[in-house]
């Protein structure tokens, strides 16, 4: 079988065998090696010499196999825009950012550029849980039956109503979507405003 050509090698049809790791150089009509992630082209290829790569300097990176003559500058996450760093920049990957807790991404340009505060969910509702953090503003949904939530908050969850009998007490007032059950000692009389509702 034919030995596989090693870059640089001639290419008549302007395509290279390994599209990820090689590129077509039109001046010499050859296929040359790309530089691996974390490196850049320090010397271009010729008919007799393959690409020479060098490591990206500190605070710069290249994420992919490339034939770039420079590395990209690392950019910090912009905390003024509500972003926080979740992984620092390395020679092979740019800084990874996301919105801080309590914020959502309000502006995208290939990646999130600006986060804003999540809106509050009013009493009787809670924020619908999303799979991914920081991806959208709160969508408030009513507490399900038997649950309540009594604050205006972006993060408060509906809680189950207290079961008075579990505490050896009796119900004085039923819970609502916005308030918990009121319990009382079984020996205490009902407050005057509720005495009319008692079955004798």
């Amino acid at each position: 079988s034919q030995p596989q050509a090693v870059p640089p090698y001639a290419s008549e049809n302007q395509t290279c065998r390994d599209q990820e790791k090689e590129y077509y150089e039109p001046q010499h009509r050859i296929c040359c090696s790309r530089c691996p992630p974390g490196t850049y082209v320090s010397a271009k290829c010729s008919r007799i010499r393959d690409t020479v790569c060098a490591t990206c300097a500190e605070n710069s990176y290249n994420e992919h196999w490339n034939y770039l003559t420079i590395c990209q500058l690392c950019r910090p996450c912009d905390p003024v825009m509500g972003l926080e760093e979740i992984a620092p920049c390395t020679s092979k990957r740019k800084t990874q950012c996301r919105c801080q807790p309590g914020m959502f991404c309000a502006a995208w340009a290939l990646e999130c550029t600006h986060c804003e505060l999540l809106s509050d969910c009013p009493p009787g509702t809670e924020a619908e849980l999303k799979d991914e953090v920081g991806k959208g503003n709160n969508h408030c949904v009513p507490c399900k039956a038997g649950h309540f939530q009594n604050t205006s908050s972006p993060s408060a969850r509906c809680q189950p109503h207290t079961r008075c009998e579990n505490q050896g007490l009796v119900e004085a007032a039923p819970g609502t979507a916005q308030s918990d059950t009121t319990c009382k000692n079984p020996l205490e009389p009902l407050p005057p405003e509720m005495s009319g509702t008692m079955l004798m």
């Epitope: 905390p79 509500g82 926080e84 992984a87 990874q96 801080q100 807790p101 914020m103 953090v133 993060s155």
Partner: antibody, heavy 114, light 107 residues
């Protein structure tokens, strides 16, 4: 160098309260969310909650209504007010930088016992 | 909440051994996983973030791999100072969760 220094722990009776502090240096504190984590004796790590740069808070269910996180960005200080303490709250309490908890303080010990 | 299951819970090994600790998430967490080392009486120290990126100053004998739900911490050649407890932690969710820990002891 990022440094976090917790203080305010101690021995407290069940039902009692403490205010834990975390003094931050070496980074722009006001820009970062901050996290509290605790570790009961001989046990694993438990996330307590996170506070964002503007003071918005998220808590784990077991401490909701009893613990309150706050911060003073002008003093580069984070606080955890712990109320209605129970025996099971006995632990070393750590503050950590960012919601990812990338750098931790040395911890402060809270012992709840009668 | 996302559950993190770490195994083994304890491990005896000798200096020079290659050691592997695994961590499984109850749902996909992309590469939002850190590994921490904790020595008795000390705070946890982050060794690895984003599943495989080494913190600066951490020896290259430590490595991490995995994505999605299954992750691995490997120590290629154990040194005396590596005997400690190791924890995985997910940060895909703001409510961080930790594995139960792996206590690495001298055989």
């Amino acid at each position: 160098e990022v440094q976090l220094l917790e203080s305010g722990g101690g021995l407290v009776q069940p039902g009692g309260s403490l205010r834990l502090s975390c003094a931050a240096s070496g980074f722009t504190f006001s820009y970062y969310a901050m996290t509290w984590v605790r570790q009961a004796p001989g046990k694993g790590l438990e996330w307590i909650g996170v506070i964002n740069s503007g003071g918005g808070t998220y808590y784990t269910d077991s401490v909701k209504g009893r613990f309150t996180m706050s911060r003073d960005n002008s003093k580069n200080t984070l606080y955890l007010q712990v109320n209605s303490l129970r025996a099971e709250d006995t632990a070393v309490y750590y503050c950590a930088k960012a919601s990812t908890a990338d750098v931790w303080g040395q911890g402060t010990t809270v012992t709840v016992s009668s | 909440d996302i559950q993190m299951t770490q195994s083994p819970s304890s491990l005896s090994a000798s200096v020079g051994d290659r050691v592997t600790i695994t961590c499984q998430a109850s749902q996909g967490i992309s590469n939002y996983l850190s590994w921490y080392q904790q020595k008795p009486g000390k705070a946890p120290k982050r060794l690895i973030f984003a599943a495989s990126s080494l913190e600066s100053g951490v020896p290259s004998r430590f490595s991490g791999s995995g994505s999605g739900t299954d992750f691995t911490l490997t120590i290629s050649s154990l040194q005396p100072e590596d005997f400690a407890t190791y924890y995985c932690q997910q940060y895909n969710s703001y409510s961080l969760t930790f594995g139960g820990g792996t206590k690495l002891e001298i055989k």
